[in-house]
């Protein structure tokens, strides 16, 4: 909501999760792994990489089925705490200028830092208009105090807020699982909010920094290493 059409393939780590329709976003973090939101779990997912217009085959797409879908073991569907999911692709993505991985964070998100949020979610705060072309939004990371004041009792240490307290610009339904990137690092995953783009109701995002070890451990445990003796 309140964003702009991204330059084509300018967000090369952005993926679309498809189950006959686009239902969530995600981020490519290595040639065979995608991170998304825990609440985007489905038993069958096709991962679509290199997308810009999700309704048109433009020639840069890679459609790869999910081989493994691993939700965080402490995901809570009621509070959306630990709202993170890993998807192992059935075959590695071909990395090129339009499809490439985003780095995991080396430090937690800092208030005031500019970030890029992207997705194919609803662009209306009231009503429905799901775009075909990838939308981008530049938004600042808010302080934890502002975040907690916006959602008293709802914000855990695994969440942070990004956006504008005055409303008008925000992620929305259909953007879940997608990236929040600051300084070339994946800081957030689109998670939840009360409505979209409402005053004093900024978007709430999964704090990826808290899951770097879980991500690395899960990837290691689900990768086949051939040991030669």
């Amino acid at each position: 909501v309140g964003g702009y059409i991204c330059e084509e393939n300018s967000v090369p780590y952005q993926v679309s999760l498809n189950s006959g329709y686009h239902f969530c976003g995600g981020s490519l973090i290595s040639e065979q792994w995608v991170v998304s939101a825990g609440h985007c779990y489905k038993s069958r997912i096709q991962v679509r990489l290199g997308e810009h217009n999700i309704e048109v085959l433009e020639g840069n797409e890679q459609f790869i089925n999910a081989a493994k879908i691993i939700r965080h073991p402490k995901y809570n569907s009621r509070t959306l705490d630990n709202d993170i999911l890993l998807i192992k692709l059935s075959s590695p993505a071909v990395i090129n200028s339009r499809v490439s991985a985003i780095s995991l964070p080396t430090a937690p998100p800092a208030a005031g830092t500019e970030s890029l949020i992207s997705g194919w979610g609803n662009t209306l705060s009231s009503g429905a208009d799901y775009p075909d072309e990838l939308q981008c939004l530049d938004a600042p990371v808010l302080s934890q105090a502002e975040c907690e004041a916006s959602y008293p009792g709802k914000i855990t240490n695994n969440m942070f807020c990004v956006g504008f307290l005055e409303g008008g610009k925000d992620s929305c339904q259909g953007d879940a699982g997608g990236p929040v990137v600051s300084n070339g690092e994946l800081q957030g995953i689109v998670s939840w909010g009360y409505g979209c783009a409402q005053k004093n109701r900024p978007g709430v995002y999964t704090k990826v920094y808290n899951y770097v070890d879980w991500i690395k451990d899960t990837i290691a445990a689900n990768s086949h290493h051939h040991h030669h003796h």
Partner: antibody, heavy 125, light 107 residues
Framework: QVQLVQSGAEVKKPGASVKVSCKAS????????ISWVRQAPGQGLEWMGW????????NYAQKLQGRVTMTTDTSTSTAYMELRSLRSDDTAVYYC??????????????????WGQGTTVTVSS | DIQMTQSPSSVSASVGDRVTITCRAS??????LAWYQQKPGKAPKLLIY???SLQSGVPSRFSGSGSGTDFTLTISSLQPEDFATYYC?????????FGGGTKVEIK
Amino acid sequence: QVQLVQSGAEVKKPGASVKVSCKASGYTFTDYAISWVRQAPGQGLEWMGWISASTADTNYAQKLQGRVTMTTDTSTSTAYMELRSLRSDDTAVYYCARGTEVVGKMTVYLGMDVWGQGTTVTVSS
Amino acid sequence: DIQMTQSPSSVSASVGDRVTITCRASQGISRWLAWYQQKPGKAPKLLIYAASSLQSGVPSRFSGSGSGTDFTLTISSLQPEDFATYYCQQANSFPITFGGGTKVEIK
């Protein structure tokens, strides 16, 4: 295979209550929601309400608000729909149907892909 | 509430005919529309979801199109088992609403 099996037909008197069950199998119950839809004789489909199997959040049709309660029992993968203060115009076939969850900022898509066989409820004095 | 208006309410057709049913939403619902087939005494069966995606196991003679407010279900070559009532449903927001139905009858 994925299926929803509903309880048997009921005959009730006006003013009474009815509770219809819907047992799910073949999938993870808490990954989906359940909608309830009814169809009066010779009429079209009328949505009654929706319940999240994972959070128990509900959304009811306004005309039934106060008379209907939807619940789930995750231990038995069963959804229930109770309708109180029955009237003759509640005579219908009642269906449960599987739908997607409405969680966070996931795309809201409220279609129903698997339906129960239907439960006939007759309200007559 | 979003009103769904289906037309025609009934259509008489022969085996092999192309049949088109339309559904109009009172406000924009993007692609969030489903089509169901119902035979007498049976539960509805999902045919098309998200306006144009064919449900697994449904014959390819069924297709859906549209976005926003205007949607179409097409049966490219009517088969004997297709004589039934068809309903559209907006899947965009609560309260969920259905069209009034279109009965496809044998001519």
